[in-house]
Amino acid sequence: SERCDDWGLDTMRQIQVFEDEPARIKCPLFEHFLKFNYSTAHSAGLTLIWYWTRQDRDLEEPINFRLPENRISKEKDVLWFRPTLLNDTGNYTCMLRNTTYCSKVAFPLEVVQKDSCFNSPMKLPVHKLYIEYGIQRITCPNVDGYFPSSVKPTITWYMGCYKIQNFNNVIPEGMNLSFLIALISNNGNYTCVVTYPENGRTFHLTRTLTVKVVGSPKNAVPPVIHSPNDHVVYEKEPGEELLIPCTVYFSFLMDSRNEVWWTIDGKKPDDITIDVTINESISHSRTEDETRTQILSIKKVTSEDLKRSYVCHARSAKGEVAKAAKVKQKVPAPRYTVELACGFGAT
């Protein structure tokens, strides 16, 4: 056959669906690779063809659209499973072509099994709720397009294994789950199961997401430098190792980039000639506030190094702060044996 623009295997779109549930999968060509949509392509006389390669096989084969009850069907640029089976797992290809044009892309589809508590190998989206922030909602995700607006589905919400009912601060409201006041105890996996009828059959859509309760913007502050501070002086003799920790607390801020860096005499360590190393460690609180520690280390400090200015800087979306470390050269201790002996008139 003639040349075809092959976009390869789009592993960015690792699609995971539950066994025995409907799945609607849009051809990624129109979403990520081509500058026109399906309607335009169809009007221009292009045909969308689907085929697949089973798991652990190399052979591309056409998709069987003549299964009982139309279990697999195509509608415009969507491939439908009503429902999926475990052995539908494989790489699926959609190809758009006519006599003069051809473009195709493949993507992996994994049909996964869940246990009785909705645990599975499915990668879960994370939804962050602000702690004690007032009413916040999560919405049952990725259920659009499965049934018409005239169909009224039933939605059951679970936290872990248990139906959400009589919870103090969590209320199911159809497709939404409302948190009246989010607390750390609300951390966990939440599952909505949408049940709807279609052509005399009942279908279920299971969607699980992880809720993480994080620090509220109401409580957010600019970065706080705990160290260096005015109470600690780094006194060293030449030849000793100089270690100065810069420890900074960052309030949780959605999509904020937290930065910590040192300057030595106003320059970044990379821009000066002395042999300095920086080691960073990061820890998080239960509400995802962040503590970053950067330890500045000079293995064998010189008297010149001890005269330099060492400043720790920190920046977040809330602001920028800086703090200088107090560094000085240790005054040599008196050599007591000699001096005291002289004092007593020893010859």
Partner: antibody, heavy 117, light 107 residues
């Protein structure tokens, strides 16, 4: 379409055990709950317990705890209900009922178990 | 265990009549209520789940409503094929429990 086919009628002596099977087809056996419900002659429905064949998780009604055992064979898509220490009041029709969640969407045809000396 | 009380235990109505069956729970069940239909000598069939969700293939003359502890099954226009016993069942808290049943007959 979903089908649950149960084993045939049984006549048992008091003190013995009975094992009723329920063969499932037309859906993913490991992804739904299999419930067991009984109905004594002329009486209402009584839930006994359920099993999730995917991971073997079971829940039993307190009344039957220790006397009923629910199992599932994934290779044959068959669920089993074994009731031991039978007495005359266990005479009933025993149903299996499949539910993706908690409602029992589809039921087997029922198995009559008669306990008589 | 949650007790489910159905009323009436039996009723007789004419074809085309509106029929109402009620079910009362011994505590709130948060709409986690199903209705089943059982015809003589047959297995039960799910009619309605989660108080008001019509199961696939069930005629629209069947409807459910209620909240808290009190729930209702309504047949808007009784048909000869609706002769059966109807059971409510809670699935709020294990063990699942059924009402005693309501036998519906044609006058």
């Amino acid at each position: 379409q979903v089908q649950l086919v149960q084993s045939g009628a049984e006549v048992k002596k008091p003190g013995s055990s009975v094992k009723v099977s329920c063969k499932a087809s037309g859906y993913a056996f490991t992804s739904s709950w299999m419930n067991w419900v009984r109905q004594a002659p002329g009486q209402g429905l009584e839930w006994m317990g359920r099993i999730y064949p995917g991971d073997g998780n079971t829940h039993y009604a307190q009344k039957f705890q220790g006397r009923v055992t629910l199992t599932a064979d994934k290779s044959t898509s068959t669920a089993y209900m074994e009731l031991s220490s039978l007495r005359s009041e266990d005479t009933a029709v025993y149903y299996c009922g499949e539910g993706y969640l908690d409602p029992m969407d589809y039921w087997g045809q029922g198995t009559l178990v008669t306990v008589s000396s | 265990d949650i007790q489910m009380t159905q009323s009436p235990s039996s009723l007789s109505a004419s074809v085309g009549d509106r029929v109402t069956i009620t079910c009362s729970a011994s505590q709130g069940i948060n709409n986690y209520l199903n209705w089943y239909q059982q015809k003589p000598g047959k297995a039960p069939k799910l009619l309605i789940h989660y108080t008001s969700g019509l199961h696939a293939g069930v005629p629209s003359r069947f409807s459910g409503s209620g909240s808290g502890t009190d729930y209702t099954l309504t047949i808007s226009s009784l048909q000869p094929e609706d002769v059966a016993t109807y059971y409510c069942q809670q699935y709020s808290i294990l063990p699942w429990t059924f009402g005693g049943g309501t036998k519906v007959e044609i006058k």
